[in-house]
């Protein structure tokens, strides 16, 4: 059979089963890709959007690895990646995605590795991904790369339908907490990268979930803003006994200022001000006590004023009662006139 043609701006190798369309200013996916392609690079172009049918079998029945990074993609539309039966690896990194359709992969995809480094900086794309994952369209996913996205929080339940996930990269974001993240369904998770975030403390709930993941052997927590107060006590205890954390000796406090630079593993309970109830900073406690005292004082003064003016208040109450009685008697009299048919004309023509 004659060799398949190579799209004009691209470079093809049948022996390597690879097509590269790199930095060619393409505005759409070339429609005439050779059927042998397993590895497709379309990077550094200006695609803008990826519509349904741009990539489809049977023409691309062998396509296993697809790199679409750095293409100025703003939208991946419903069905855009649905008809690729062999797709295992997808890189959408470095695209300013605003829309990632929950139906982009159709109902179910064989995808195993998904890279979205720097592609989820807009809320719409993140929520689209969350919907897509929760719908179970990527149940075969074993690697998910979400680094460098400026994420503050992950949508609740986002990781709930990923039973095959082995590697999760959340590094270089702005995550402040993991309270709403459930790791329980990630039974095959082996590595979790949370380095270069803004985590202040890991709560008991998160630590318990990690303890319950039998395959989880590599957790990276470096370069976070650990707050070394009483709330970190459980995390420190977990760190000391866990063999899951990479480079745990290097983890150090960022706050408060007096603790900055101190190694987490070398902290003692006595340094953490744990006499007060957990999770309430001592400065805040002092403020609440002071506020309570002020309110109590104001209440006492108010009662004292009432007590000292009790005669005046009694007289004032009597006056109000008399005024009310006079008012009510007026109403009572008018009611009686209106009720007597003989006095109806009188009542309507008088000022009573």
């Amino acid at each position: 059979q004659p060799p398949a043609a190579c799209p004009a701006p691209c470079e093809c190798s049948e022996a390597a089963k690879t097509v590269k369309c790199v930095n060619k200013n393409l505005t759409e996916v070339p429609p005439d890709l050779p059927p042998y392609v397993r590895n497709l690079f379309i990077t550094g172009n200006r695609l803008g959007r990826l519509p349904a049918g741009a990539l489809s079998a049977p023409r691309l029945a062998e396509l296993g690895s697809l790199n679409l990074s750095g293409n100025h993609l703003r939208a991946v539309e419903a069905g855009a990646l649905a008809a690729l039966p062999a797709l295992r690896q997808l890189d959408l990194g470095g695209n300013p995605l605003a829309e990632l359709s929950p139906l982009a992969f159709g109902r179910a995809s064989p995808l195993e590795e998904l890279a979205l480094r720097g592609a989820l900086r807009e809320q719409g794309a993140l929520l689209g991904l969350a919907d897509l994952l929760q719908a179970g369209a990527l149940r075969n996913l074993s690697r998910l790369e979400l680094a460098d996205n400026g994420l503050l929080l992950l949508p609740t339940g986002m990781l709930g339908a990923l039973p095959a996930l082995r590697h999760l990269d959340l590094s270089n974001n702005s995550l402040v907490g993991l309270r709403n993240v459930s790791f329980q369904g990630l039974v095959r998770l082996q590595s979790l990268n949370l380095s270069d975030n803004s985590l202040g403390v890991l709560r008991n709930g998160t630590l318990a979930q990690w303890r319950g993941l039998p395959a989880l052997r590599r957790i990276s927590l470096s370069h976070n803003t650990w707050v070394c107060d009483c709330a970190i006590e459980d995390m420190v205890a977990w760190l000391k006994e866990s063999d899951q954390v990479e480079g745990k000796e290097a983890l150090s406090c960022a706050f408060p200022e007096k603790m900055a630079g101190r190694a987490l593993l070398k902290l003692n309970t006595s340094e953490l001000n744990c006499s007060a109830p957990v999770d309430v900073p001592s400065q805040l406690q002092t403020s609440y006590v002071f506020l309570g005292i002020v309110l109590a004082l104001i209440g006492a003064i108010f009662l004292l004023v009432l007590y000292l003016n009790r005669k005046g208040i009694k007289k004032w109450m009597h006056n109000i009662r008399d005024a009310c009685r006079d008012h009510m008697e007026g109403y009572h009299y008018r009611y009686e006139i209106n009720a007597d048919p003989r006095l109806t004309n009188l009542s309507s023509n008088s000022d009573v």
Epitope: S13, A15, T18, K20
Partner: antibody, heavy 122, light 107 residues
Amino acid sequence: QVQLQQWGAGLLKPSETLSLTCAVYGGSFSGYYWTWIRQPPGKGLEWIGEIDHSESTNYNPSLKSRVTISVDTSKNQFSLKLSSVTAADTAVYYCAGWFGELYHYYYGMDVWGQGTTVTVSS
Amino acid sequence: EIVLTQSPATLSLSPGERATLSCRASQSVSSYLAWYQQKPGQAPRLLIYDASNRATGIPARFSGSGSGTDFTLTISSLEPEDFAVYYCQQRSNWPLTFGGGTKVEIK
């Protein structure tokens, strides 16, 4: 970790058929290229041919008329047959696999069998 | 068929020195080039693939560069275990071909 183990006859007479088998352990069999390479004594490496999961084959034109590579997916094995051997076919024969890492799409032969020395002599 | 020419055939150096090995293709192979190391009695070992990507477990002192027809393998500081024969190999066109090899020996 994927490993390859190969076996087959080491001593042949001219005009006989060389037959070698390579078994794949510890990894997926489908989706990869399976390759045979040989190295005559004191010389460089020569590519014989390869087969993929869909049983599509490619052979070195210099050997094409004599070579057959096949797979048995049920046993995770692939085989080499080279007919009408001569003394020039004396070499160490290696089986090898093309694997790779995430987001790198051209793979080198990163898994090799231990090699089988084949001598052709009358 | 694409012919790969390696130079020099032999490189005599001392441990700690820098080794620069060259591979030239008779026509463009894009970046579809790999480098292998082979020691006596052993199977080759993949060092570099796609011209510049280090294979799993390969030390950082090994680096590859080049595209098209000219490629280089550099060993920044030779260790005693690096003395071996090095082969380049292309996967741009069938048949796949290897270079003739460069032997790095102790001076």
